[in-house]
C-alpha cells in the first residue's frame, strides 16, 4: 500500500513539476526591468527565452521574438537547451511511469518490469529536474553578473549634461516557477526511485541451489539474506492494489509584475 502511494505521489509531483518546467520555459518574464532605485519609466521591459516584451503605461504590450540563432548569447542558448532537455526527459519519464504505475494493470506485466520502469522514470525525472534547476540557475547567474555590471556604469556620460540610463534587469517570475518546478520534478523522481525498491520482487534474485548429500536430497534455500539491504517489508506473494492515485489541480495566476500607479 505504501509503495503504491509513494509511486502515485511521485508521479503526481513529477507531473506538476514538468508542467511547471514547460510553463517556465514558455513564460516571457525570465528577467524583468529592475524598478528599485531606478529612474521611473513609463515603459516596463521584460524578457523570456524566446522573445522580449515592452509594456507601455496604457497597458499596450509589444513582444518581439529573437529571430536570430547565431546572434544570441551562448548562455541563453545553453539555458534553452537545458530546459528543452528537461522537458523531453520529463515527458518520456511521464510516459514510462504511466505504464509503471502499480495501480494500472497492463496485460501480464511482471512486478520486476514495473520496478525497472519505475526506476527508469525516476532517474529521468531526477535528471529532468536537475536540467531545469541548472538552466534557471545559469540564467539567474547571468542576470546577477549583468546587473552588477550595469550598476557599475549605470549612468554613462554622453558628453556635456546628456546622460543615457541603462535598463537593469532582475529575476522574473519564470525563474521562481522554474526553480520550484525543477525541485518538484526532482522530488517526484526520488519518490519513484524509492517506490522502485518496494516493487522489486525479493525472491527472484536467487535461484534455489540443490546440494546432493549421500542418501538424502536436501534443497537449500538461502532465507534470511537479502541482495540489497533495506528493500522494504517482505511481502512474499501478497499483491497490493490501490484504487488509483489522487491528482491535484494547481491553478496559478501570475499577477502583472509592474502595476502602474
Amino acid at each position: 500500500m505504501a509503495v503504491t502511494a509513494c509511486q502515485g505521489l511521485g508521479f503526481v509531483v513529477s507531473l506538476i513539476g514538468i508542467a511547471g518546467i514547460i510553463a517556465a520555459t514558455c513564460m516571457d518574464q525570465w528577467s524583468t526591468q529592475d524598478l528599485y532605485n531606478n529612474p521611473v519609466t513609463a515603459v516596463f521591459n521584460y524578457q523570456g527565452l524566446w522573445r522580449s516584451c515592452v509594456r507601455e503605461s496604457s497597458g499596450f504590450t509589444e513582444c518581439r521574438g529573437y529571430f536570430t540563432l547565431l546572434g544570441l548569447p551562448a548562455m541563453l542558448q545553453a539555458v534553452r537547451a537545458l530546459m528543452i532537455v528537461g522537458i523531453v526527459l520529463g515527458a518520456i519519464g511521464l510516459l514510462v511511469s504511466i505504464f509503471a504505475l502499480k495501480c494500472i494493470r497492463i496485460g501480464s506485466m511482471e512486478d520486476s518490469a514495473k520496478a525497472n520502469m519505475t526506476l527508469t522514470s525516476g532517474i529521468m525525472f531526477i535528471v529532468s529536474g536537475l536540467c531545469a534547476i541548472a538552466g534557471v540557475s545559469v540564467f539567474a547567474n547571468m542576470l546577477v553578473t549583468n546587473f552588477w555590471m550595469s550598476t557599475a556604469n549605470m549612468y554613462t556620460g554622453m558628453g556635456g549634461m546628456v546622460q543615457t540610463v541603462q535598463t537593469r534587469y532582475t529575476f522574473g517570475a519564470a525563474l521562481f516557477v522554474g526553480w520550484v518546478a525543477g525541485g518538484l520534478t526532482l522530488i517526484g523522481g526520488v519518490m519513484m526511485c524509492i517506490a522502485c525498491r518496494g516493487l522489486a520482487p525479493e525472491e527472484t534474485n536467487y535461484k534455489a541451489v540443490s546440494y546432493h548429500a549421500s542418501g538424502h536430497s536436501v534443497a537449500y534455500k538461502p532465507g534470511g539474506f537479502k541482495a540489497s539491504t533495506g528493500f522494504g517489508s517482505n511481502t512474499k506473494n501478497k499483491k497490493i492494489y490501490d484504487g488509483g492515485a489522487r491528482t491535484e489541480d494547481e491553478v496559478q495566476s501570475y499577477p502583472s509584475k509592474h502595476d502602474y500607479v
Epitope: T41, A42, V43, N45, V54, S57, S58, G59, V162, Y260
Partner: antibody, heavy 120, light 113 residues
C-alpha cells in the same frame, strides 16, 4: 467619437479650493488613463497628474503632490481634479487629456481647457 | 526631472518654405527593449488644446498631413514641415513620454512673415 468636455472658467480667491471636471464620451472610460496638464499664460505645458479610472490609481508629478487631488466617477464617466490652497501662480489653463493605447504614452485626445484665475 | 530644450523658440517663415525645429532631452528617450524613442510632438493653435502629431518620435498620428515628418533618436529630435501652409501656424511642443514626471519643451512658435 471620443470627446472630453471640461467645466467652465473659475475665478477664485487665494487659499481657496476649486474642483475641475472632465466629462468623457465615445470610449470606455475605465480603460484609459486621464491626464491633467497645466499651461500658464504664454508659457509651456506642465504635466500635473494622471488617473486610471478603472482602479482609481493615480500618479502625481511630485511638484503637485498636496496641491492636486484626483477622483473619477465611473457612473458619469467624469474625471475630477481638485486644486487646494490656491496661490497666484496656480492661475493657468488646465487641460484634461486621454492617454492613447499603443501610442507611446502620448495623449491623443484633449479637453478644451478650463481657465483658473486666482485673484483677490 | 528630464529637461526638454526646444530650439528655436520662434520661427518666422513664408508659405511653401521648409521648416525644421529641434528638441533635445537631458537623457536618452530610447528604450532598449523595443528600440523606440518615447518622444511625442504636439501642435497647439491659439486658443485650442494641443493636438497629437507624432509619437515614438516618428510615428505619424492618423489625420496628420504627410508634409510633417518626425525624426531623431536618443536625445536629439527634429520636426520638419516640408512645405509650410498658413494652417500650420502654431506652437509646437515636444514631450518626454519615457520618464516620470512627463516633461514638455518650452515650445517653438511658428509665425508667418
Amino acid at each position: 467619437q471620443v470627446q472630453l468636455k471640461q467645466s467652465g472658467p473659475e475665478l477664485v480667491r487665494p487659499g481657496a479650493s476649486v474642483k475641475l471636471s472632465c466629462k468623457t464620451s465615445g470610449y470606455i472610460f475605465t480603460n484609459y488613463w486621464i491626464h491633467w496638464v497645466k499651461q500658464r499664460s504664454g508659457q509651456g505645458l506642465e504635466w500635473v497628474v494622471r488617473i486610471y479610472p478603472g482602479t482609481g490609481n493615480t500618479y502625481y508629478n511630485e511638484k503637485f503632490t498636496g496641491k492636486a487631488t484626483l477622483t473619477a466617477d465611473k457612473s458619469s464617466s467624469t474625471a475630477y481634479m481638485q486644486l487646494s490652497s490656491l496661490k497666484y501662480e496656480d492661475s493657468a489653463v488646465y487641460f484634461c487629456s486621454r492617454e492613447g493605447y499603443g501610442k507611446g504614452n502620448s495623449m491623443d485626445y484633449w479637453g478644451q481647457g478650463t481657465s483658473v484665475t486666482v485673484s483677490s | 526631472d528630464i529637461v526638454m530644450t526646444q530650439s528655436p523658440s520662434s520661427l518666422t517663415v513664408t508659405a511653401g518654405e521648409k521648416v525644421t525645429m529641434n528638441c533635445k532631452s537631458s537623457q536618452s528617450l530610447l528604450n532598449s527593449g523595443n528600440q523606440k524613442n518615447y518622444l511625442t510632438w504636439y501642435q497647439q493653435k491659439p486658443g485650442q488644446p494641443p493636438k497629437l502629431l507624432f509619437y515614438w518620435a516618428s510615428t505619424r498620428e492618423s489625420g496628420v498631413p504627410d508634409r510633417f515628418t518626425g525624426s531623431g533618436s536618443g536625445t536629439d529630435f527634429t520636426l520638419t514641415i516640408s512645405s509650410v501652409q498658413a494652417e500650420d501656424l502654431a506652437v509646437y511642443h515636444c514631450q518626454n513620454a519615457y520618464y516620470y514626471p512627463y516633461t514638455f519643451g518650452g515650445g517653438t512658435k511658428l509665425e508667418m512673415k
